[in-house]
Amino acid sequence: EEELQIIQPDKSVSVAAGESAILHCTITSLFPVGPIQWFRGAGPARVLIYNQRQGPFPRVTTVSETTKRENMDFSISISNITPADAGTYYCIKFRKGSPDTEFKSGAGTELSVRAKPS
């Protein structure tokens, strides 16, 4: 079967403070079974930005409809961006298990925050 690829097409995104940032992520396979999660940063200090189990994540919305069947678009929008949001965001596929285990990561999208226009 087709090997899963996680495509984050934007290497970087620049957003003015107070605006919304869209972080794109698509996958090429429904396998392995398991969830997608978004993180800022890598390693043990990474911060969970979105998954569908925990939360709420009041500033994060999914771009695709939540009732879309066989969804392969896991892009998110983060509202009211502040300088604290700057960093590299990773879209990561987990393999279902007890607990779920990280399977593959996208290449990451670096979010930079511009000063709010006066």
Partner: antibody
């Protein structure tokens, strides 16, 4: 049209083995997770097992005794059932999984089922 | 394991009546609930997924609602072909996928 056709059911004694098959057509079999769900006579539905690509999941009641597998070249799902018990007596349904949004799976197409009877 | 409790176990209804089925989860399952119809001697048929989305080809007299722990399936005007058993299923936390015990709809 999606079609799922189970076969391989029958009457066996406790401790014996049986292998169920499910022939799938009308969709791209290899890209979907597939499951087995059973229904004991006069009872409700009980999930048995699910397979993704090579990832497999089992109900506690069958773990270590049943093995789910698939042959994508033949569009066929299998359930190898060993050490069968009287409580495994049921109609076994093959079901195609569907995912929605960012969440888990439900079953959007079902076969007609095959009856497995375990009796001494 | 998430337990789904369906009530009532049996409903006696006349054609044309409005019918409501309840499914209660032992813990929060968000909107990750599907509903199935099973007629005697037949396989289950998907009616509703994501708590309220009708599957392709399902008549609009069927509707689902709820989130969290309490879910409802409603048939606005029962037709003769709607008799059978209705099951809810959660897919929020698995394995295992779990089903409710079912609600049987019979002719009054």
């Amino acid at each position: 049209d999606v079609q799922l056709v189970e076969s391989g059911g029958g009457v066996v004694r406790p401790g014996e083995s049986l292998r169920l098959s499910c022939a799938a057509s009308g969709f791209s079999f290899s890209i979907y997770a597939m499951s087995w769900v059973r229904q004991a006579p006069g009872e409700g539905l009980e999930w048995v097992s699910t397979i993704g690509a090579d990832d497999t999941y089992y109900a506690d009641s069958v773990k270590g005794r049943f093995t789910i597998s698939r042959d994508n070249s033949k569009n066929t799902l299998y359930l190898q059932m060993n050490s069968l018990r009287a409580e495994d007596t049921a109609v076994y349904y093959c079901a195609k999984d569907s995912t929605v949004g960012w969440s888990g799976d439900f079953f959007d197409y079902w076969g007609l089922g095959t009856l497995v009877t375990v009796s001494s | 394991e998430i337990v789904l409790t369906q009530s009532p176990a049996t409903l006696s209804v006349s054609p044309g009546e409005r019918v409501t089925f309840s499914c209660r989860a032992s813990q929060n399952v968000r909107s990750d609930i599907a509903w199935y119809q099973q007629k005697p001697g037949q396989a289950p048929r998907l009616l509703i997924y994501a708590a309220s989305s009708r599957d392709t080809g399902i008549p609009d007299r069927f509707s689902g609602s709820g989130s969290g722990t309490d879910f409802t399936l409603t048939i606005s005007s029962l037709q003769s072909e709607d008799f059978g058993v209705y099951y809810c299923q959660q897919y929020y936390d698995w394995p295992p996928f779990t089903f409710g015990g079912g609600t049987k709809v019979e002719i009054k």
